[in-house]
Structures are given as C-alpha cells and as structure tokens.
C-alpha cells in the first residue's frame, strides 16, 4: 500500500436492474483488477422530480479522475445519470451532488442511500 | 483474459453511416469506460471519444462532434460508434479500447467509405 | 486540445538505446502524470506499453521505461531487439472529464 493513499478492496453493491441483469440486488463486491493498478468505488444514480434513484453502485476500474477521492462526489452540472467514484472500502455507500460550476450554493444535501 | 470483440469490414456510400461494435468480455463491462479511436491508411491514431459504460455518459472529441453518437448496452455488454454523414476521409480502421488508460484494444473495423 | 508532438522516426542498432519524446504543453503532459505509450506493429491493434507516465502495463519488459520532464514525456528503449521495431505512440488518459489526445507517432527502425 502507497503510505496516504486509500486502497479499495470493496464496494458497497447495488443493482436496481438486478432481476434483468441476473445479479443480486444488494451486498459488496470485492474489487479485481490489474495488480499494479488502483481500483475504485462508484455510483450512479437519478434525480427524478426530487427523488433519489439509485441505478448502480459498485467497483470501478483505474480512472485518474477518481484519485485520492475520499467521498464520492458528482461535480457535473445537472447530468442525465449522475455519477462519482471515490478511493477507499465502501466510500461510496454515500454520496452526494456539488455543482462545479454553481455559484450559488448547491440544492442537494448528501445523499444515504436506503436500497428498496 | 479481457477481450474486445469488433464487428467486420463495412464498405459504405458517401453520405451514409455507418454503426461498429464492441463486445467485452473477461470483466465487469459497467466498471469503466470505452474509448474509440480511428486510424487511416498510413496515418496516426485519432481519439473520437469515450463513454462511461455504466452511466453512459459521453464525450467527442471536437473534430467529430455532431457526426458521432457513441453507446453502450450494458445487457450485452458491447459499446457502438455510430458516424455519420461518411465521406471518403472517414476510411480507417476503427478500435474500441477499455478504460482512460486504453489499456485493452479491439481489433479494429476497417470501414471504406466509397461511391 | 491539440496533438501531442512526437519526432516522426527514431532508430538503433541490437543492444542500444532509444529515446522517443513527446511534447505537450504545461496545461496537459506538464501537469498531469496521465500519459500513456502504446506500440502497433503494422497490421496489428496497438498495445499499451506505459500508463500514468511511468508504470510498466503487466507484462511489458522491463527494457521499455518512461518518465517525464516538464512538457516532454519520454519512452526509453535499452537492449534494443529486433521485434522491437514498430510505430510508438503516446496519448492521454481519456475519460471523465478528461479529453483523449495523441502524439503523430514515432516509427522506431532497429538497424
């Protein structure tokens, strides 16, 4: 392990399609990758008229824009499906929406899922 | 082991599209991102643009915005360039590539664009 | 985001070593450790050598190494082979927020 840095092992798991897909709908997931390369966290999710949706959650492969990410954080302005990734076990069991490019302060708090 | 698995040689008409696949297999196909890039008879590479499998997500490179519609269906784990508007400049071999890093390529699709 | 520069051919003899450069500009190669280098042989898909500057892709010899100086990243061949001789390319990490971008090439003739 890189002294300072979080290494991901495993994600919290979620899949709302899971009956379509064949998966499970909820657990964690042991991350797998190449061994040189870090591994991380993600989520995805909708805002649909207020309402969080979550859409997938789970183990991301090694992606610069990831890095040393403690919390899992959407930056993008009012994306279709968000998305955020984030460095550590289980960080992305939270995650929340922060606006770039907002100058006024952002409307969505932090965001804990509860799966159905 | 990884793999990407494109579809054949196209031969299209001036004006028309044309739409090139790429089946992944050997990984979790939702966990990064698929780049395309293109390359003409004797020439470089050239980056096209990337979707984030799992959100879907895009971003083209500027040259291409507009003709290039890239997506991906996460059921059958394969991501599709579709180009558009074909003329005979589009002539190339064109690759899928796994994650920011490209670290797993296609085999490439030659598309011949000609009347 | 323009093209990253390369010197279009490089070469040497079985046993020495190669240098291929690739420059870009403080914003992209000078602030960032998201290069990659890629080798196609002709006919053939490239293959990922170099990731984040420096990081050898598993299975790539320890003869091919990478580094950086301010705007200009570097792929460095030692012991020279013969299999060696290829197009090199160097890129960047696509994804995100970030745009994809790649060198001209640089053809390596092992003499």
């Known amino acids: 392990a890189i002294l300072g840095r979080s290494e991901t092992q495993e994600c919290l798991f979620f899949n709302a399609n899971w009956e379509k897909d064949r998966t499970n709908q909820t657990g964690v997931e042991p991350c797998y990758g190449d061994k040189d390369k870090r591994r991380h966290c993600f989520a995805t999710w909708k805002n649909i008229s207020g309402s969080i949706e979550i859409v997938k959650q789970g183990c991301w492969l090694d992606d610069i824009n990831c890095y040393d990410r403690t919390d899992c954080v959407e930056k993008k302005d009012s994306p279709e499906v968000y998305f955020c990734c984030c460095e550590g076990n289980m960080c992305n069991e939270k995650f929340s929406y922060f606006p770039e490019m907002e100058v006024t302060q952002p409307t969505s708090n932090p965001v804990t899922p509860k799966p159905p | 082991q990884v793999q990407l698995v494109q579809s054949g040689a196209e031969v299209k008409k001036p004006g028309s599209s044309v739409k090139v696949s790429c089946k992944a297999s050997?990984?979790?196909?939702?966990?990064?991102?698929i780049n395309w890039v293109r390359q003409a008879p004797g020439q470089g590479l050239e980056w096209m643009g990337t979707i984030n499998a799992v959100s879907g997500s895009t971003s083209y490179a500027q040259k291409f915005q507009g003709r290039v519609t890239i997506t991906a269906d996460t059921s059958t784990s394969t991501a599709y360039m579709e180009l558009s508007s074909l003329r005979s400049e589009d002539t190339a071999v064109y690759y899928c590539?796994?994650?920011?890093?490209?670290?797993?390529w296609g085999q490439g699709t030659l598309v011949t664009v000609s009347s | 985001q323009s093209a990253l520069t390369q010197p279009r051919s490089v070469s040497g003899s079985p046993g020495q070593s190669v240098t291929i450069s690739c420059t870009g500009t403080s914003s992209d190669v000078g602030s960032k450790n998201y290069v990659n280098w890629y080798q196609q042989h002709p006919g053939k898909a490239p293959k990922h050598m170099i990731y984040g500057v420096s990081k050898r892709e598993s299975g790539v010899p320890d003869r091919f190494s990478g580094s950086k100086s301010g705007n200009t990243a570097s792929l460095t061949i030692s012991g020279l082979q013969a299999e060696d001789e290829a197009d090199y390319y160097c890129?960047?990490?696509?994804?995100?927020?970030?745009?994809?971008?790649f060198g001209g090439g640089t053809k390596l003739t092992v003499l």
């Open positions: 890129g960047t990490f696509a994804g995100g927020k970030y745009y994809g971008v």
């Open positions: 050997g990984y979790k196909f939702t966990s990064s991102y």
């Open positions: 590539a796994r994650g920011g890093w490209f670290d797993y």
